[in-house]
């Protein structure tokens, strides 16, 4: 957890009080079940990594949103939900990584396996940029934060 | 394409306070964060410390708070450090350097060109 | 608060390979960058834990990971490759970035 944190931001405190991040997590589990669903595999191979090589240093920039995607009906509803409530905190990128930290609590005894956890965490960091906001800079999403082994 | 022009260098007397700006250039300013790197002649890159320059939130390491003070200003996209209480171990060459990264992934492709602070009596 | 150790200096022969180390606990954890800075000049991203390599370093450097050691190796070594190298990480549980304390070098 970030040292702003433990100052205390009685603004974000009320603001995650009052938001209703369940259609997020529901629309995150759905989407990663009906990926294992689909490809009866591990669906995100090396080259759907979102940290995958590139040459452009600029490549991945966290402020070209892309805009949502409503493949399957049920998801979609979840999912813009979600990104109405991920709006509010548009403002105010600290928030914004509460936020997400607080969706990856909650859903990680539901998450089988290390497999299913990076998947959750792949897509709850793509979540930003599919809702048309801005993704958080330094915000760690994991308490064993781990990258890949080389790079 | 990004550019990040610093100011020139600058002498300054112990106990002196020093401000160093940084002028951006060719992204949205407010998008990232900036960062203060300083290196003392013949040492390594020490991080002083970073500012949001869209929320004006910032983090300072421990070594510097109390006597670093980062701004920045919108209207001309640059972004600025300030030094007090500064003693000879202060002299160093000061880099701002543009974050780069999303989440826990944080680094620095965009580099000033560097300004040589002098703390001498 | 999180330190990173490197090695003050090395040096390599042409035409070999350089592995240059940066040492902390449990670094594998942590998403870890490495610069090369030349004489009088700012420090150039090399390699990146996030896009591989930065578009203008040819692809002989990469980065690993394993416990608590990074190793930023430099394969078929050239003259052009001198200059002090630098791991970076940032620690989310203080908030800071944090640089190693530089590696020199030399190509003999």
């Known amino acids: 957890r970030q040292q702003w944190e433990l100052q205390g931001d009685r603004r974000c405190q009320s603001q995650l009080e009052r938001a209703n991040l369940r259609p997020c997590e529901q629309h995150l589990m759905q989407k990663i079940q009906r990926d294992e669903d689909s490809y009866g595999r591990d669906p995100y191979s090396p080259s759907q990594d979102p940290y995958s090589p590139s040459q452009d240093p600029d490549r991945r920039d966290p402020y070209s949103p892309s805009p949502y995607d409503r493949r399957g009906a049920g998801s979609s509803q979840h999912q813009e939900r979600c990104c109405n409530e991920l709006n509010e905190f548009e403002n105010n990128q600290r928030c914004m990584c509460e936020a997400l930290q607080q969706i990856m609590e909650n859903q990680s005894d539901r998450l089988q396996g290390r497999q299913q956890e990076q998947q959750f965490k792949r897509e709850l960091r793509n979540l930003p940029q599919q809702c048309g906001l801005r993704a958080p800079q330094r915000c760690d999403l994991e308490v064993e934060s781990g990258g890949r082994d080389r790079y | 394409q990004v550019q990040l022009v610093q100011s020139g260098p600058d002498v300054r007397k112990p106990g002196a306070t020093v401000k160093v700006s940084c002028q951006t250039s060719g992204y949205r300013f407010t998008d990232y964060e900036m960062n203060w790197v300083r290196q003392a002649p013949g040492q390594g890159l020490e991080w002083i410390g970073l500012i949001n320059p869209h929320s004006g939130d910032t983090a300072y390491a421990q070594k510097f708070q109390g006597r670093v003070t980062m701004t920045s200003d919108t209207s001309d996209s640059t972004v600025y450090l300030e030094l007090s209480g500064l003693t000879p171990d202060d002299t160093a060459v000061y880099y701002c350097a543009r974050s780069q990264g999303t989440f826990e992934v944080y680094y620095f492709v965009s580099w000033g060109q560097g300004s040589l602070v002098t703390v001498s009596s | 608060s999180y330190v990173l150790t490197q090695p003050p200096s090395m040096s390599v022969a042409p035409g070999t390979t350089a592995s240059i180390p940066c040492g902390a606990n449990?670094?594998?954890?942590?998403?870890v960058h490495w610069y090369r800075q030349k004489p009088g000049q700012a420090p150039v991203v090399v390699v990146s834990d996030d896009e591989d390599r930065s578009s203008v370093i040819p692809d002989r450097f990469s980065g690993s990971k394993s416990g608590d050691t990074a190793t930023l190796t430099i394969s078929r070594v050239e003259a052009g490759d001198e200059g002090d190298y630098y791991c970076?990480?940032?620690?989310?549980?203080?908030?800071?970035?944090?640089f190693g304390g530089g590696t020199k070098v030399t190509v003999l």
């Open positions: 449990n670094i594998a954890k942590k998403r």
């Open positions: 970076q990480v940032w620690d989310s549980k203080t908030d800071h970035v944090v």
